[in-house]
Structures are given as C-alpha cells and as structure tokens.
C-alpha cells in the first residue's frame, strides 16, 4: 500500500454533509507520545487561521481548537483514547450542521461546535508522527 | 540532497568526546509549533528508558529529560531559541565528562547534567516534524 | 563556601513528628541544579538517604520512607526542612543535611549532623 | 530494591595499596561515587563520577568501575586514611541509594 507523503496538504471546500476521512498508523509506539494532527485551514497557506484543529497525542489525550486571526482560541480537551498502540486507524471527520463529528474506527469519539462556518474551510492539513495511506472528502450530493 | 527516513534510528556508543551530529529543517512555519525530538536510547528498542531526551517546540521551547525504568524523571526547560523559522539547522550534542553540551549552528545552546553514564546508550532516534539530511556520531580517538 | 547547619529538637516522643531545619548560608537553595537532601545515620551503622528537595521545590522521597517523609522550604530563610512522622526508637540517628550539585557529582557540602534520640 | 554491597572491612599495610568495591547491578548505568567517614564527623566525598578526584582529596585516592562494580583505590595508604569509606550510586536519578560501608584499617 503506497503511502501518501506527511505533512499532507489538499484543496477543500466543506459544508454541512462532507466527510475527511483520514486512514494511517501512528509512527512511535504509545509511550513516546506520537501526535497526529489534523488542520482545517481558511487558506492555502499553512500559516492561515485554522477553523479545526484536531490534535491527538496517542495514549495520552486529544485535543480541539480554533485558531482565529492568528490566536488560538479555548482549548478542548478529552482523555477519551479510542485509538490502539501499533494499530491502523481510520478517522472521519463529518460535518454536521452545528458540529464537525470525529469517529474513530467507526465509532463516535469526538465532537467540535462550530466557532467558524466550515465553509471557510479551503485547506486540509494531516501530519505529525503518522504514515497516511488514505486521504479522502466526500461532498453531499446535493 | 537525499533526505534520511524520519524517524531515523541508529545503533550508537558513546563516551566522552562523542559527537553527535544532526542536519535537518523543520517541516511547518513555527506559527503551526513543529518539533524535533532526539533521544538517546539505553538499548535499540523504542521503548526502551532514555538517557537523555532532547525535544524541540521550534518558536517556543525546548525540554530536556530522562526516562528512567519507564518513567520521566524532573524535567529542564529552555526558552532559548535560536532555531530559525523556516532554516535548516545544525545540531551537534557533544559528550563532556559531566553534560550534554548542545549546540545550535555552531553556538552553545543547552546544556543537560549526565543523569545516567552516556555508555549506556545504544541507540539515538530523531524524530517528529523535521526532514533529515545529515546524521553523523563521531567518536573520540583514543 | 557554602555552609549547612542543622537544629531541632535532640528528643523526640514515640509517634510523634520529628522535625528538622537545615539553614543555608553561602548560597542560594533556588540555585539552579542544587539539591538539597537529608540522610541519616543510626548509631553505629551505615548512611540512608531519606529526601531531598530541588532548586525548583521539587521533592523527591526514599521509597521505604516516603509514607512518613516531607520536606519543604523557607527561601526567604534559606532554610529547608524534614518532617518525619510516627517516629519510633528505630528513627534514633544522627541527621544530616547535604547539598548534590546534580547527578554526576556527589553531596559535596555536608551539615555537621544532629543527633536525635526517640524515647519516651 | 537496588542495592550496593561492600565488604564490612578492609585491612592494608601501610604505604600498600588497598582496594575497596561495591557491587550493585545499576552501577553499568550510573555513576559510582565514594564518601569517607571518620568517628564523629560527616562524611566528605573523594570520588565521584566513577572516578573524579574533588579539590583537596589526595592524589592516591582513585576510583575506576567496570560493569555492576565500583572500585575505590588507595595507592600508599596513610594512617589518617583509617575510616568507615561508603560508595554512593543510584536506583534512579533521583533516589540516591548508599552501600553498607567498609572499615578500613590500616596496620
């Protein structure tokens, strides 16, 4: 299985109906704290301000922000740990007409109020400590 | 310039007058905080204790620490930061009879008290969110 | 040159609390690196490193000790002090106080020692 | 629980040399350092960092260690080295664990 290169950067344009869905493996096992982080920025820049950002700290803790011209803003944060040592986990992020939905190798794990309307979303960025081997957004038909 | 494969991990020995040598760039602005993280291992597992464990929150910080029969012991913190946004850095961890001495571009950043002998290392890993270009240890002459 | 003083009570009940203060002079507690420790000595036998407390407030406890052990700190008097609790005629020792640069070197400065008996 | 083994007593010639070890399985990962104690006194360090000399100490005092021993050497002892000599080392980098100490006697 061919691997996508990290950090990973695409084109994206959401709103309520659209799923990311992200598949990979953590790149250190639990006890050295990998982190996987996943960006939904308003620009193509990564420097942009990022209307969800998703941060896992593998066996330790997840944690939820926005970053609003150039500030983050209050930190989320949950121990919830759905994710397993070595393992391949596949993560959804739908969006929802009040919140993005996080699960978790099918099972819901997470949940994010929208601070920022997902459609100034332009940008996805995946990375840290993970090889990917699957990006995808799907969009509502409309 | 080829890149090495991040994580990198390689067998090593050390002693005084060992240098270890690291050439990287850091893979996002600091603004997203990308970091560096080198450990020098007591074996070649991942999961084995750390002697010393050096890591990088470029534009914010640096921790320095062991991990001793599984666990963190006290943490030293530097805000010195002369890492670069966006520049490629030279790193080299010299082996003095008492310390790590840490230099970044050819000045003497951090300094780290031996807390366990620097012959019990095994193993160095660099990792996170950097690309790699040069790794070197260099070894006294007796 | 950095002088260690011990002082406290040289008799002490059973099951009560044993307390001690080391006063520092000569040099700062909140130095960066320094530790400050307590080790005892029963008569006639060898050294037992109980505690310490570190530069940043820190403490770190003996494993066979720690349930009864607390040190803390004054640094407006740069004073440091252990507190032993439900002492027994066991805890008869010579207490000393010592400064550790860091890990590589060794407790270079010592208090000249205090001698508390346990007794009723 | 770590811990350090030293004979309980030494005895040497004057102006010979006599060794010292302690035995303990985490001295291949931390430092081994040596105390002297005489009667009535604290103790004062004369090695630490395996084998480190402080200022003052003399220089037939030395100390070398070698996989889970540590040895402290005293090349020529002197009647005033007659004392109680305890080596220090680690059962982590912050619990300090001392051996049961050694007597030397000097004849």
């Known amino acids: 299985m061919s691997l996508l290169p990290v950090p990973y950067t695409e084109a994206a344009s959401l709103s309520t109906g659209s799923t990311v869905t992200i598949k990979g493996r953590p790149l250190a096992c639990f006890l050295n704290e990998p982190y996987l982080q996943v960006d939904f920025h308003t620009e193509m820049k990564e420097e942009s301000d990022i209307v969800f950002h998703f941060q896992v700290c593998f066996g330790r803790r997840v944690v939820m922000n926005s970053r609003e011209y150039g500030a983050w803003k209050q930190q989320v944060e949950s121990k919830n740990m759905p994710f397993q040592d070595g393992q391949e986990f596949e993560l959804s992020i739908s969006v929802l007409p009040d919140k993005y939905q996080v699960m978790v190798n099918g099972q819901s794990s997470y949940t994010f109020d929208h601070r920022i309307k997902p459609e100034a979303v332009k940008m996805v960025q995946v990375w840290r400590d993970i090889s990917l081997t699957k990006f995808n957004v799907s969009y509502l038909k409309r | 310039m080829s890149l090495l494969p991040v994580p990198y991990t390689e067998a090593a020995s050390l002693s005084t007058g060992s240098t270890v040598t690291i050439k990287g760039r850091p893979l996002a602005c600091f603004l997203n905080e990308p970091y560096l993280q080198v450990d020098f291992h007591t074996e070649m597992k991942e999961e084995s204790d750390i002697v010393f464990h050096f890591q990088v929150c470029f534009g914010r910080r640096v921790v320095m620490n062991s991990r001793e029969y599984g666990a963190w012991k006290q943490q030293v913190e530097s805000k010195n930061m002369p890492f670069q946004d966006g520049q490629e850095f030279e790193l080299s961890i010299s082996v003095l009879p008492d310390k790590y001495q840490v230099m970044v571009n050819g000045q003497s950043s951090y300094t780290f008290d031996h807390r366990i002998k620097p012959e019990a290392v095994k193993m160095v890993q660099v990792w996170r969110d950097i690309s790699l270009t040069k790794f070197n240890v260099s070894y006294l002459k007796r | 040159q950095v002088q260690l003083v011990e002082s406290g009570p040289g008799l002490v009940k059973p099951s009560q609390t044993l307390s001690l203060t080391c006063t520092v002079s000569g040099g700062s507690i909140t130095t960066n690196s320094y530790y400050w420790s307590w080790i005892r000595q029963p008569p006639g036998k060898g050294l037992e490193w109980m505690g310490a407390?570190?530069?940043?407030?820190?403490?770190y406890y003996s494993p066979s000790l720690k349930s009864r052990t607390s040190i803390s700190r004054d640094t407006s008097k740069n004073q440091f002090t252990l507190h032993l609790s439900s002492v027994t005629p066991e805890d008869t020792a010579v207490y000393y106080c010592?400064?550790?640069?860091?890990?590589?070197?060794?407790?270079?400065?010592w208090g000249q020692g205090t001698l508390v008996t346990v007794s009723s | 629980n770590f811990m350090l083994t030293q004979p309980s007593a030494v005895s040497v010639s004057l102006g010979q040399t006599a060794r010292i070890t302690c035995q303990g399985a985490?001295?291949?990962?931390?430092?081994g350092i040596w105390y002297q104690q005489k009667p009535g006194q604290a103790p004062v360090q004369v090695i630490y960092g395996d084998s480190n000399r402080p200022s003052g100490i003399p220089e037939r005092f030395s100390g070398s260690s070698s996989g889970g021993t540590a040895t402290l050497t005293i090349s020529g002892a002197q009647a005033e080295d007659e004392a109680d000599y305890y080596c220090?080392?680690?059962?982590?980098?912050?619990?300090?664990?001392f051996g049961g100490g050694t007597h030397l006697t000097v004849l």
């Open positions: 985490n001295l291949g990962r931390y430092y």
């Open positions: 220090q080392s680690y059962e982590s980098s912050t619990s300090p664990v």
């Open positions: 407390i570190a530069y940043s407030g820190s403490t």
């Open positions: 010592a400064r550790r640069p860091n890990w590589y070197r060794a407790l270079d400065a």
